[in-house]
Amino acid sequence: AQGKEVVLLDFAAAGGELGWLTHPYGKGWDLMQNIMNDMPIYMYSVCNVMSGDQDNWLRTNWVYRGEAERIFIELKFTVRDCNSFPGGASSCKETFNLYYAESDLDYGTNFQKRLFTKIDTIAPDEITVSSDFEARHVKLNVEERSVGPLTRKGFYLAFQDIGACVALLSVRVYYKKCPELLQGLAHFPETIAGSDAPSLATVAGTCVDHAVVPPGGEEPRMHCAVDGEWLVPIGQCLCQAGYEKVEDACQACSPGFFKFEASESPCLECPEHTLPSPEGATSCECEEGFFRAPQDPASMPCTRPPSAPHYLTAVGMGAKVELRWTPPQDSGGREDIVYSVTCEQCWPESGECGPCEASVRYSEPPHGLTRTSVTVSDLEPHMNYTFTVEARNGVSGLVTSRSFRTASVSINQTEPPKVRLEGRSTTSLSVSWSIPPPQQSRVWKYEVTYRKKGDSNSYNVRRTEGFSVTLDDLAPDTTYLVQVQALTQEGQGAGSKVHEFQTLSPEGSGNLAV
């Protein structure tokens, strides 16, 4: 295919509108206008041939490189003969220098010579002698240079005058391209042909309207050969969310359908509990009262928070409560139900209430529970407790209302003391016990009841304020039933389990610990 010239910059065609930068301002190069055939002709000229030490710069506006790798610069200019000036003007020159600088951004009026690289010295094939100049017979020169490969987003050209009498009438910058192409939902623009015969220019394709490169996928690329043919396609584009492939284009999903990501799949029908989608939908909006959690895929039906837990029961066991409940009757359409238990305690005397999370102990962390039961211990006696069990799922955070059930329980007794046998002899048993620290302040005394096993007619009672007692005057090698009960101002607390402890036989004398 025949390479096409694509113009990046055309001074002559711009009608003096480009506003190139001159340095120093106004003293060297300047824009001039002439009228030819009733049309304005613009040129940048400089002619300070008599002054010596000239260093005048003319910089183009920033030119976006686009796909160009090698650019071609065509200049049309006139140069006046130095002999047109008195004494041949010793400082007069008949050439000027062409420079370029690449950059990723437009530096605006910030001009720095050091950033520019010389392309060439531009010399005229023909100079305009004095007689020709006065007769308006100027000799127009055409010179072309090329630069490449270019890598930055754009570039500037600059023209340095060192004391010539030059008029620059045309500056045209262009590059050569392969024809545009549509392949794999990617549009390949007319693109610069390789600058050397064996080279292939790699060209990034642009996805067609409503197509994108899939995440992790390769950008569409092709190679433009020197003859203008496209070779070696790589990568592809996919229709973006809300669009599906129809021939070589991406078409919006029909109403009632959606596509939530760039993929090769077609649009899908809106899931349950969604409103009918408009054309080009990337997801389907949820019905009133239904929601989509951030992590929910768009293909999943919309869901709602669960109803409250079902059948909550609180069974008191001394200073413990076992809470049990059944799952909500309405799960909201989700599997991710978790439960949170909160506790409130109320003092019967004052009616004052407050949270009790800090003073009670749960058999497992009370938030984010997946099981439907939990045991709460370390409850204080003679206290009213209200337990709230809240059911939540992945969309509960999207609403302000909560789904919970409450159960109340009164703790009238202290927790049964935990009893241990500390030591024994043939005629004595040393017993100790403990109850949870929060309850200890309420205990007035502890009552230890003991009797021989099998003898239901008589028993002995000992009272103590401490946490241990030694039971004396016992029969050797005999099993005793021992129970400890806390006594509070309000009455008796829960009794411990009845423990069986045996005194030593006469042969095994000595006070041995168990």
Epitope: G16, T22, Y25, G26, D30, Q33, N48, S84, F85, P86
Partner: antibody, heavy 120, light 109 residues
């Protein structure tokens, strides 16, 4: 229509200051270099100063360098000349003028002129 | 030198042709522009570049240049052409940015 309207002239004592304004209308002010040119009573035209379209570049005649400052506000389409340390020889009609192309002219649009008299 | 020299005065009979000259080294490098100024008014651009007239300027005004000289010619002068005429050019010496001639008073007799 395309025009430049000047204001700010008047009588000022030697050593004093004055600010001239030149309001542009009817054209894209920010695309043109602007100049001040003065004319002493009964004398010829004398170029004073220039400012580039974006206001980044200025240049002054030796006779006013260090005393006069040219500036522009493209958002207000207005050109200014701040004149300090005025001397009797600065007495003149001051014109603002548009350079039709480039930095140096020709001057295709002129203001009506404003008289600055420096006298004690 | 960065000066432009004009004759102080020139006169012409109505309908006749008159030429006002402007001399200066800068004119070897740069074209002159010509301005007309009538009493109490701002200057008006007449000619610029090789020989370009802004719209509204009668075609009896023309410009030319040769070497260090530029000329403004009025072919068939009219009474309303009585005015001061100034040449102006870029300065090639680097001393100034742009220079004006001293002006020529044209009298139409």
């Amino acid at each position: 229509q395309v025009q430049l309207v000047q204001s700010g002239g008047g009588l000022v004592q030697p050593g004093g200051s004055l600010r001239l304004s030149c309001a542009a209308s009817g054209f894209t002010f920010s695309s043109y270099a602007m100049h001040w040119v003065r004319q002493a009573p009964g004398k010829g035209l004398e170029w004073v100063t220039v400012i580039s379209p974006d206001g980044h570049n200025t240049y002054y005649a030796d006779s006013v360098k260090g005393r006069f400052t040219i500036s522009r506000d493209n958002s207000k389409n207005t050109l200014y000349l701040q004149m300090n340390s005025l001397r009797a020889e600065d007495t003149a009609v001051y014109y603002c003028a548009r350079a039709s192309v480039g930095a140096t002219g020709p001057f295709d649009i002129w203001g009506q002129g404003t008289l600055v008299t420096v006298s004690s | 030198s960065s000066e432009l020299t004009q004759p102080p005065s020139v006169s012409v009979a109505p309908g006749q042709t008159v030429t006002i000259t402007c001399q200066g080294d800068s004119l070897r490098s740069y074209y002159a522009s010509w301005y007309q100024q009538k009493p109490g008014t701002a200057p008006k651009l007449l000619i610029y570049g090789e020989n370009n007239r802004p719209s509204g300027v009668p075609d009896r005004f023309s410009g030319s240049s040769s070497g260090t000289s530029a000329s403004l010619t009025i072919t068939g002068a009219q009474a309303e052409d009585e005015a001061d005429y100034y040449c102006n050019s870029r300065d090639s010496s680097g001393t100034h940015l742009t220079v004006f001639g001293g002006g020529t008073k044209l009298t139409v007799l």
